[in-house]
């Protein structure tokens, strides 16, 4: 499919001008290559009329120009003094006319309306309001006032001052007679339809002395604004319909076959399933304007979109509307990244978020898409060191691997973490990506004690058991804080006995805290990584308490997972309590349960082989 994009249809009137914008991917080659505008012949060729290399055909001499805007990836063709002979099929393109890097444009030039003398022309947008003013003389002040519409050869009564209203105009028309001083009546028509266009006649009086005034009403269908966005990128539709519809329900719909327009999202809470997790409707300003953001653009998102206002929250005849034609460029600069990441309850995920590598200094954000209200994505973590309170100890945003990608790690997963998350920056707003976290059946791969109590001044050893599938990974311990997870020294204690059916490649890696201080209290993670790519993590909360009896602490899985408040008094161990205050998330569902059952290979955060767009918590 050609990545060139422009208007499919351009309509104008004899004597007028048109400006046609064509879009192209702004690669270095494309920016500098030849741009052209050519007319398609009956036998399939395309004859150049104007090009960026200076050629102008005799047909266009003195009335056309072509301007390239390489920084935007667009070029514009302006044609003036249009005649009906200019109607036809054209191409705007790059390179050689026959190469296929082009877009087909149909230009239709029509004859101007043949208007009677003294005709007032009213040009109004679809869905808006028109006021037709009708002057009259004093002798007709007390006589009947009326408005007719010319249908074929016959005038048809639309409204009159005796109270008649044509059924086609019911509920949207009124006739106002100005105060006695002004010899003027006016007809106001709301929610204009395309079918309202035509010739009208105002009349005051019914005899030969009546006053008459001709009016020509032109109802304009909004020309779609062309929008050119990259595959996997995002688009923002800004919809400003005016303060008169500030309190009316708003919608964005996508035109399907014929006149149908399927609601994508509206302010009444409707949202199309295809856009779940990747659309946000920003609330309206006081003037009624609003915007809709769609991210994770797909090929099938291309098409014509309308925004409008109607009490039903969908397109109806007479809705004021704005239109866009969205083209999704498949030659995208935005890299592929998994759209689905899977993890198990108690386990973890590592999400890779792409950003524009030119903006490495921008602030990175990760937020939770909220489906209940159309416009919210509350921040969970940023690259500046802010973490939402409920996520302390289990969420971290890392600038690694860098060079256009950052990593978000979320552990201690529960079913409540399933949902859609957005990666954002405060830089290029087109780089917003969505990832869905799914919680699947299985056990966490890494085994750590539930939570641990250390004693001031003593030594604490905390184990982390890694199954053999991670034999080739780097294993680490780190202390979590709101700016990341600071690496700590750890000891490889040899093969782990926590896994049945696992060979000598399983590993027990311990964290040792010597001479424990109050500052050692907090969250500790053990995890695996390959270079700058992070895999699974497991979290342990270490509480610190006063010395009660001498001895160092060596925490085992079984001992540390004793039931809350259970006394564990074997030699070398002290009481281990689940301290709800220090570990605010120890609900039964959320506690990362460590056990010694056989680890099925599908139990880790996994990659579905069926989808190149899915990533597991420990994949790259």
């Amino acid at each position: 499919k050609s990545p060139i994009f422009g208007p499919e249809e351009v309509n104008s009137v004899e004597g007028n001008s048109v400006s046609i914008t064509c879009y192209y991917p702004p690669t270095s080659v494309n920016r500098h290559t030849r741009k052209y505008w050519c007319r398609q012949g009956a036998r399939g060729g395309c004859i150049t009329l104007i090009s960026s290399e200076g050629y102008v055909s005799s047909k266009y001499a003195g009335r056309a120009n072509l301007t390239n805007f390489p920084e935007n990836g667009t070029f514009v063709v302006n044609i003036a003094q249009l005649s009906q002979d200019d109607s036809g099929r054209y191409k705007c393109g790059l390179g050689i006319n026959s190469r296929g890097l082009s877009f087909d444009v149909s230009l239709e030039v029509s004859q101007g309306p043949g208007l009677l003398n003294d005709t007032k022309v009213y040009t109004v947008d679809l869905g808006r309001t028109v006021t037709i003013n009708c002057p009259f003389k004093t002798e007709n002040a007390q006589k009947r006032k009326s408005l007719y519409k010319q249908i074929g050869l016959y005038p048809v009564l639309v409204i009159d001052s005796s109270g008649y209203v044509n059924p086609n105009y019911t509920g949207r028309i009124r006739l106002d007679i100005q105060g006695t001083g002004q010899l003027l009546f006016s007809v106001v028509i709301n929610q204009l339809r395309l079918s309202d266009a035509g010739q009208y006649l105002c009349q005051a009086g019914d005899d030969s002395n009546s006053n008459k005034k001709n009016a020509d009403l032109q109802v304009l269908k909004p020309e779609p604004e062309l929008v050119y966005e990259d595959l996997r990128g995002s688009v923002t539709f800004h919809c400003a319909l005016g303060p008169e519809v500030a309190n009316v329900a708003k919608f964005l719909c996508r035109q399907s076959s014929g006149e149908n327009c399927d609601v994508v999202v509206n302010t009444l809470g409707k949202r199309a399933p295809a856009f779940e997790g990747r659309i946000l409707l920003n609330p309206q300003d006081k003037d009624g304007s609003f915007s809709v953001v769609i991210t994770g653009l797909r090929k099938e998102d291309a098409g014509r979109y309308l925004c409008g206002a109607h009490s039903d929250g969908q397109l109806q005849e007479g809705s004021p509307i704005q239109a866009w034609q969205l083209f999704v460029n498949e030659e995208s600069t935005i890299p592929r990244s998994p759209t689905v990441v899977k993890g198990v309850a108690g386990g973890s995920v590592a999400v890779l978020c792409p950003y524009n590598r030119k903006e490495s200094k921008s602030i990175k954000y990760w937020c939770l898409w909220e489906g209940a209200q159309n416009g919210r994505c509350p921040l969970l973590v940023d690259s500046e060191g802010w973490v939402k309170a409920q996520y302390e100890g289990r969420l971290s945003l890392l600038e690694e691997p860098g060079n256009g990608t950052f990593t978000v790690i979320l552990n201690q997963l529960t079913s409540r973490d399933a949902g859609f998350y957005w990666c954002l920056t405060n830089g290029d707003t087109l780089w917003r990506t969505t990832v869905e976290i799914k919680i699947i059946e299985g056990e966490p791969n890494l085994k750590v004690p539930g939570n641990v109590t250390a004693v001031l001044g003593e030594t604490l050893k905390v184990p982390c058991h890694f199954p053999c599938k991670f034999s080739s990974y780097e294993k680490y311990w780190c202390k979590w804080n709101n700016t990341g997870c600071q690496a700590l020294p750890s000891q490889d204690e040899g093969p782990s006995k926590a896994f049945v059916n696992c060979d000598e490649n399983s590993r027990l890696v311990s964290l040792t805290l010597n001479l424990v201080t109050r500052a050692d209290e907090g969250w500790y993670w053990c995890g695996v990584k390959q270079g700058h790519f992070y895999g699974e993590t497991a979290a342990v909360y270490v509480a610190v308490e006063e010395r009660k009896a001498a001895g160092s602490r060596d925490v085992s899985l079984a001992k540390a997972d004793a039931a809350p408040d259970e006394k564990v008094l074997d030699s070398g161990f002290r009481e281990i309590e689940n301290k709800a205050i220090q570990d605010p998330r120890l609900f039964a569902e959320e506690k990362a349960v460590a056990d010694t059952r056989d680890q099925a290979d599908g139990s880790r955060a996994s990659v579905d082989s069926g989808s190149s767009e899915e990533q597991g918590g420990s994949s790259r």
């Epitope: 921040l379 060191g385 802010w386």
Partner: nanobody, 131 residues
Framework: EVQLVESGGGLVQAGGSLRLSCAAS????????MGWFRQAPGQEREFVAA????????YYADSVKGRFTISRDNAKNTVYLQMNSLEPGDTANYYC????????????????????????WGQGTQVTVSS
């Protein structure tokens, strides 16, 4: 809701120093940025300094750079403004402000210097610098 109470204002000679404090209470876990703004009689309220509540990144108006320092104590939910080399032009009512974490997409584009981004405001404390 977050409540903010400023203190530390007063009368000081040009060239002198003052330290303003702003204590936050209520739902302080929702705070994202805290900032100081000032308003002189007949003037619009203007940005002075701001601090990111998580990592502590700071932002300053050009007019106070090198003279004023903003800092925070998360444990005490307090933000400070240390004002040195004070000038008569610094005379104003100083207001402390707090901003909630972003929720709407437009929030992510807002800058700490923008007055409209702040959700909560203190009553203000008067600083008068005499020449």
């Amino acid at each position: 809701e977050v409540q903010l109470v400023e203190s530390g204002g007063g009368l000081v000679q040009a060239g002198g120093s003052l330290r303003l404090s702003c204590a936050a209470s209520g739902r302080t876990s929702s705070i994202y940025n805290m900032g100081w703004f000032r308003q002189a009689p007949g003037q619009e309220r203007e940005f002075v300094a701001a601090i990111h509540w998580g990592g502590g990144r700071t932002y300053y108006a050009d007019s106070v750079k090198g003279r004023f320092t903003i800092s925070r104590d998360n444990a005490k939910n307090t933000v400070y403004l240390q004002m040195n080399s004070l000038e008569p032009g610094d005379t104003a009512n100083y207001y402390c402000a707090a901003r909630r974490a972003p929720e709407l997409l437009d929030d992510y584009k807002q800058k700490p210097e923008e007055i409209g981004t702040y959700h909560y405001w203190g009553q203000g404390t008067q600083v008068t610098v005499s020449s």
